[in-house]
């Protein structure tokens, strides 16, 4: 057991052109915090895959407000280290993700909002108990400077925190066969419980008599470095004597990946692609629990009470993503009906309705005709958020106050002549055409294109339709 410690030194614009805008402003002051996620081994994993070695969240940094016109400086940082405790052996090789988050503190109804500002990732080798390692990582125009180390928690010591130390029973020396525990010279190595000869640097055990190897080491006592450079074939198990991979069955034979993981061969061995909620070399370990606080922006962590059940984040309205890290443009869902204007106020959506509509989503059609009168015998028709008059023959306009010229729109087709009439209009059709609007040709045999002429009218007669 031990602790991985991360010290953030600075977060600010990187060198070169295109300095980023400050994430904070006078209108929207903000403060930063950091999240670190650790995974064992050197596998290139997606940002969403679980933090198998552990995760930690920093405190909030000091509130920062941009000075108008000034370039974005290094931003004020939270105090203290980020500490990620690990229960088992330190793997020696690990992948990390460090996220910089911004907490907006503007006049937000319903509290602050969080958004991801930058994410850096890397893969490193690191022995526990060693000095601080310094690093610089860039994400877009931002630059993050930090140091990290892994240290063992007593009584564990060694580069993997697998050797145990105990206070000396006698003041002067350790018991038979036991060495002093460097660097704790006043303590003694605890009696070995691993298989005799198991490498104290590259092997460890969880059960008496076993010897399990850290990544990069092989052999029954974990004393042989894995190396493929002088080998003829990249397939098969490691030779305990040379560390070479000798020909043998394919590494994915029998699918070594548990819990529904899929296996793919790599130049050195195999790699498991694990389903959501599982991780590890063989997908044998389940993922982050709710205790790791994976949900942002007020999200509630559901499930994930223990490492065998995957968590889900229930996100507040306005956020989405597996960790509620993405802000949603709720207006893009076009929730306002009948042409209403959508406003996302953060704490709620508002719809500004067009005239004639009301309700939270402009869903109610108001009585457009209330108090409206249509002149000259017209009748009011609702619709479209504004009243409309259906006018009696001979009248037009919004309120049927205008006397209409029924021939103004040239309603008679094929050269027919239009006559205004007290009850509408009459079309006198040109030879060869008939119909109320002269729209039907008369066939040469005297039959018309109409199914039947109205009784009392011969084809070619002027027709008046009331």
């Amino acid at each position: 057991a031990g602790v991985f410690e991360l010290q953030i030194h600075s977060f600010g614009p990187g060198p070169g052109p295109g300095a980023p805008r400050s994430p904070c402003s006078a209108r929207l002051p903000c403060r930063l915090f950091f999240r670190v996620c650790l995974k064992p081994g050197l596998s290139e994993e997606a940002a969403e895959s679980p933090c198998a070695l552990g995760a930690a969240l920093s405190a909030r940094g000091p509130v920062y407000t941009e000075q108008p016109g000034a370039p974005a400086p290094d931003l004020p940082l939270p105090d203290g280290l980020l500490q990620v405790p690990f229960r088992d052996a330190w793997p020696g090789t690990f992948s990390f993700i460090i996220e910089t988050w911004r907490e907006e503190l503007g006049d937000q109804i319903g509290g602050p909002a969080w958004s991801l500002l930058a994410r850096v990732a890397g893969r490193r080798r690191l022995a526990a108990g060693g000095p601080w390692a310094r690093d610089i990582q860039r994400a877009g125009a931002w630059e993050l400077r930090f140091s990290y180390r892994a240290r063992c928690e007593p009584p564990a010591v060694g580069t993997a925190c697998t050797r145990l130390c105990r206070p000396r029973s006698a003041p002067s020396r350790c018991g038979p066969g036991l060495r002093p525990c460097a660097p704790l010279e006043d303590e003694c190595e605890a009696p070995l419980v691993c298989r005799a000869g198991c490498s104290p640097e590259h092997g460890f055990c969880e059960q008496p008599g076993e010897c399990r190897c850290l990544e990069g080491w092989t052999g029954p006592l974990c004393t042989v470095p894995v190396s493929t450079s002088s080998c003829l074939s990249p397939r098969g198990p490691s030779s305990a004597t040379t560390g070479c991979l000798v020909p043998g069955p394919g590494p994915c034979d029998g699918n070594p990946c548990a819990n529904g993981g899929s296996c793919s061969e790599t130049p050195r061995s195999f790699e498991c692609t694990c389903p959501r909620g599982f991780y590890g070399l063989r997908c044998e370990v389940s993922g982050v629990t709710c205790a790791d606080g994976p949900c942002f922006n007020g999200g509630l962590c559901v499930g994930g009470a223990d490492p065998d059940s995957a968590y889900i984040c229930h996100c507040p309205p306005g956020f989405q993503g597996s960790n509620c890290e993405k802000r949603v443009d709720r207006c893009s869902l076009q929730p306002c009906r009948n042409g209403g204007l959508c406003l996302d106020l953060g704490h709620a959506l508002r719809c500004r309705c067009r005239a004639g509509f009301a309700g939270p989503r402009c869903e109610h059609d108001l009585d457009d005709c209330a108090g409206r009168a249509c002149a000259n015998g017209g009748t009011c028709v609702e619709g479209g958020g504004a009243h409309r008059c259906s006018c009696a023959l001979g009248f037009g306009g919004r309120d049927c106050r205008e006397r209409a010229d029924p021939c103004a729109a040239r309603p008679c087709a094929h050269g027919g002549r239009c006559y205004a009439h007290f009850s509408g209009l009459v079309c006198a059709c040109a030879p060869g055409y008939m119909g109320a609007r002269c729209e039907f040709p008369v066939h040469p045999d005297g039959a018309s294109a109409l199914p039947a002429a109205p009784p009392g009218l011969r084809p070619g007669d002027p027709q008046r339709y009331l």
Partner: antibody, heavy 118, light 108 residues
């Protein structure tokens, strides 16, 4: 002004189903999560469950097998059904709105007392 | 589930005095997702504090919240007659949502 009003029978017989409705005014039921909380006489608060209009629900494991929460967006209402009730389910039942900044309760109904007795 | 333990069960004070109420969580509450409510007899609870320290709309500044991790505190700097009530804490870090057992602040 957001207002919530619970209603339903005040007396339910043991082994029957308790049914309550909460009418929401001043806020669209589609914009928030909505929850039910109960408080036995003289005791503390117990969260029952919540719902989002999309159908997402989450119930207290201690009540999960007996609880159903639903919403009717057209009426701006949510409802609670609790089956196989016993005297231990006698309580004041509150509906509440869940805030957008997190899963806490920013508006509450005045509560309705439901007594389970034969 | 996260169990919230409030102490003391009852706090007897006079108007004008300072009240300090404690809420302790059985597991760490991430991101300070903790709220405080006030409840008077025959009424529904009223939100006072969220995010451990942010005052809800319309809450007087004599109410303040603090703490992180497993230990949280609600402080009423000078008790007014209308502040005598029962106070509950609630965590909203993970499901199930849980409340503390309450602290009753009554008049000495």
């Amino acid at each position: 002004q957001v207002q919530l009003q619970e209603w339903g029978p005040g007396l339910v017989k043991p082994s029957e189903t308790l049914s309550l409705t909460c009418t929401v005014s001043g806020a669209s039921i589609s914009s928030f999560y909505w929850s039910w909380i109960r408080q036995p006489p003289g005791k503390g608060l117990e969260w029952i469950g919540y719902i989002y209009y999309s159908g997402t629900t989450n119930y207290n494991p201690s009540l999960k097998s007996r609880v159903t929460i639903s919403v009717d967006t057209s009426k701006n209402q949510l409802s609670l059904k609790l089956s196989s009730v016993t005297a231990a389910d006698t309580a004041v039942y509150y509906c509440a709105r869940i805030a957008v900044a997190g899963f806490f309760f920013d508006y509450w109904g005045q509560g309705t007392l439901v007594t389970v007795s034969s | 589930e996260i169990v919230l333990t409030q102490s003391p069960g009852t706090l007897s004070l006079s108007p004008g005095e300072r009240a300090t109420l404690s809420c302790r969580a059985s597991q760490s509450v991430n991101k300070n997702y903790l709220a405080w409510y006030q409840q008077k007899p025959g009424q529904a609870p009223r939100l006072l504090i969220y995010g451990a320290s942010s005052r809800a709309t319309g809450i007087p500044d004599r109410f303040s919240g603090s703490g992180s991790g497993t230990d949280f505190t609600l402080t009423i700097s000078r008790l007014e007659p209308e502040d005598f009530a029962v106070y509950y804490c609630q965590q909203y870090d993970r499901s199930p949502l849980t409340f503390g057992g309450g602290t009753k602040v009554d008049i000495k």
